[in-house]
């Protein structure tokens, strides 16, 4: 499901239930947001005018979406997952009797649950979780999120120490579903795929529709923006990132000290000033480096270039080239080559293109 692509999230209370004092409503909603900000890097601030990310509404019956409320009891509230417009908004059924205590329906407890949905959580099957689908009063003074709730929200946003999430509102990220979108570099990292572009990378977990956008600097503060090539040696938990004539080594997602180093340590001639794309093939234990219209092949075991290179891309990768932007290896038999907004699935055993796609096809666009 969707997540908020930023750290700083605004909310606005559109109107107030007559069942409670306004201050008590404000307090209950503020404390409910705090429950989630305590365990994530998210920060919530209340605004009183203008367009908030999350609109809190008290309404009865039909109220502007397909999900009309049903009078007292039954559905107490509902909330929409992250997104623009109605996305994130939390609606509370005015036909309930909202309270600060155990009588009626406790606003704080209901709001914690609904805000969970506003942040992208679904329901939990753990009866102890606040995201369990049925309402049950618990003492609000000793209320705690369950381990399942925390696991769920941190799988979306990380823990509070990780300042690893997503750009702030003023950083403009490229539009993921722009049909003209191209990438600077792409690589697998375990079961994830990292797509690099400018200051950002998108993270795609294999076979799942969810993707998240991140600032490169928020994950690796010592690395530059504009990564130009990347490859992974999964068996060693290593990722190599390239920009200009330098490269960085990431081990177990942490940058190694004493980097960057010169790309010429791989054995490139001096005229090579940057790498366009790189991919490691674990079947041959070779890394392919693409530079302009040529490529080199590097033996990772012997730590040296194979003889007879460079070769022309177009000669040895039928239908690919003359230049490429990015490439990664997947499913034991494919290279995915990126050229501008196009992507080519290339079977390296059959040595031919098997599919032509848009570069952003991995994101359900």
């Amino acid at each position: 499901g969707p997540v908020w692509r930023k750290h700083y999230i605004t909310y606005r209370i559109n109107n107030y239930t007559p069942d409670m004092n306004r201050e008590d409503v404000d307090y209950a909603i503020r404390k409910a947001f705090q429950v989630w900000s305590n365990v994530t890097p998210l920060k919530f601030s209340k605004i009183n005018t203008g367009m908030a990310d999350i609109l809190v509404v008290f309404a009865r019956g039909a109220h502007g979406d397909f999900h009309a409320f049903d009078g007292k009891g039954g559905i107490l509230a509902h909330a929409f997952g992250p997104g623009s417009g109605i996305g994130g908004d939390a609606h509370f059924d005015e036909d309930e009797f909202w309270t600060t205590h155990s009588g009626g329906t406790n606003l704080f407890l209901t709001a914690v649950h609904e805000i969970g949905h506003s942040l992208g959580l679904g329901h939990s099957s753990d009866p102890k979780a606040v995201m369990f689908p049925t309402y049950k009063y618990v003492d609000i003074n000793t209320f705690r999120l369950s381990a399942d709730d925390i696991r769920g929200i941190q799988s979306l946003y990380g823990d509070p120490k990780e300042n690893q999430r997503l750009p702030n509102p003023d950083n403009s990220e490229p539009a993921l579903c722009d049909p003209n979108l191209s990438f600077d570099a792409v690589t697998t990292v375990g079961n994830k795929i990292f797509f690099f572009k400018d200051r950002f990378f998108w993270l795609k977990v294999s076979e799942r529709p969810k993707t998240s956008v991140n600032l490169i600097s928020s994950l690796w503060p010592t690395l530059p923006s504009g990564i130009e090539a990347a490859y992974e040696i999964e068996a060693r938990n290593q990722v190599f990132l390239f920009k200009d004539d330098k490269y960085w080594l990431i081990s177990n997602l942490r940058p190694e000290p004493n980097y960057p180093k010169s790309i010429h340590s791989f054995g490139f001639p001096n005229f090579v000033k940057k790498i366009d794309a790189a991919v490691f093939n674990p079947r041959f234990y070779r890394t392919y480096f693409f530079v302009d219209n040529q490529y080199w092949r590097y033996d990772e075991r012997r730590q040296m270039m194979d003889p007879g290179y460079p070769k022309l891309i177009t000669k040895n990768f039928q239908g690919i080239g003359p230049k490429i932007d990015a490439v990664f290896y997947s499913k034991n038999k494919y290279y995915y080559f990126f050229q501008g907004s196009n992507q080519f699935e290339y079977d390296f055993l059959l040595q031919r293109i098997t599919k032509t796609l848009k570069s952003n096809s991995w994101f359900g666009c």
Epitope: G64, F66, I86, C365
Partner: antibody
């Protein structure tokens, strides 16, 4: 590129039945709400029915309740509208529309098919 | 039940004109209002969502405003391709439509 392609329209007698299909491609179909919207000749748009991602939650306009059934097959990326007890006033172009949301429907239709014409006449 | 009233039902204007179409709900719908454009023989296309957000690819001469019960769609300078029918919509309810014709 998102594509929605309706089929199954045609001429049917009052009281008859018809099943419309909408084949979806270019996006991951299963997480999204899907809807049918119709337009009688020379008239405005009328929302007909909507269905949640898993198919468990459905909504209908009062004008078709009890006569039309919306369904979906996520394995085939296809939306359906079974129309029974058809009346002359059901004559319209029927559009399939994709909601921008899952979980709860926003009723915001970001992509539409080209429509299929249903004519109910004796 | 919520009802949407759109006005005017038709409108004649010239290229370069500024045009405003209004939509009124009989109860608050917050900012949950969308605008669509439909050309003859074509499917509707989303222009504006959440009252004022411009759908990707829609020219900036289109703008929307309003919240609660009163909403407007404005075309700042009409272009030949803008002559079409416009609908406001909230969940399962569409306005009656406004046909924009060349004067």
């Amino acid at each position: 590129e998102v594509q929605l392609l309706e089929s199954g329209g045609g001429l049917v007698q009052p009281g008859g039945s018809l099943r419309l299909s909408c084949a979806a491609s270019g996006f991951t179909f299963s997480p999204y709400w899907m809807h049918w919207v119709r337009q009688a000749p020379g008239k405005g748009l009328e929302w007909v029915s909507g269905i949640g991602p898993s198919g468990g939650l459905t909504f209908y306009a009062d004008s078709v309740k009890g006569r039309f059934t919306i369904s979906r097959d996520n394995s085939k990326n296809t939306l359906y509208l079974q129309m029974n007890s058809l009346r002359a006033e059901d004559t319209a172009v029927y559009y399939c529309a994709k909601d921008i949301r899952g979980a709860y429907s926003s009723g915001l239709f970001d992509h539409w098919g080209r429509g299929t014409l249903v004519t109910v006449s004796s | 039940d919520i009802q949407m009233t759109q006005s005017p039902s038709s409108l004649s204007a010239s290229v370069g004109d500024r045009v405003t179409i209004t939509c009124r709900a009989n109860q608050s719908i917050y900012t949950y209002l969308n605008w669509y454009q439909q050309k003859p023989g074509k499917a509707p296309e989303l222009l504006i969502y959440a009252a004022s957000s411009l759908q990707s690819g829609v020219p900036s001469r289109f703008s929307g405003s309003g919240s609660g019960t009163d909403f407007t769609l404005t075309i700042s300078s009409l272009q030949p391709e803008d002559f079409a029918t416009y609908y406001c919509q909230q969940a399962g309810i569409f306005g009656q439509g406004t046909k924009l014709e060349i004067k």
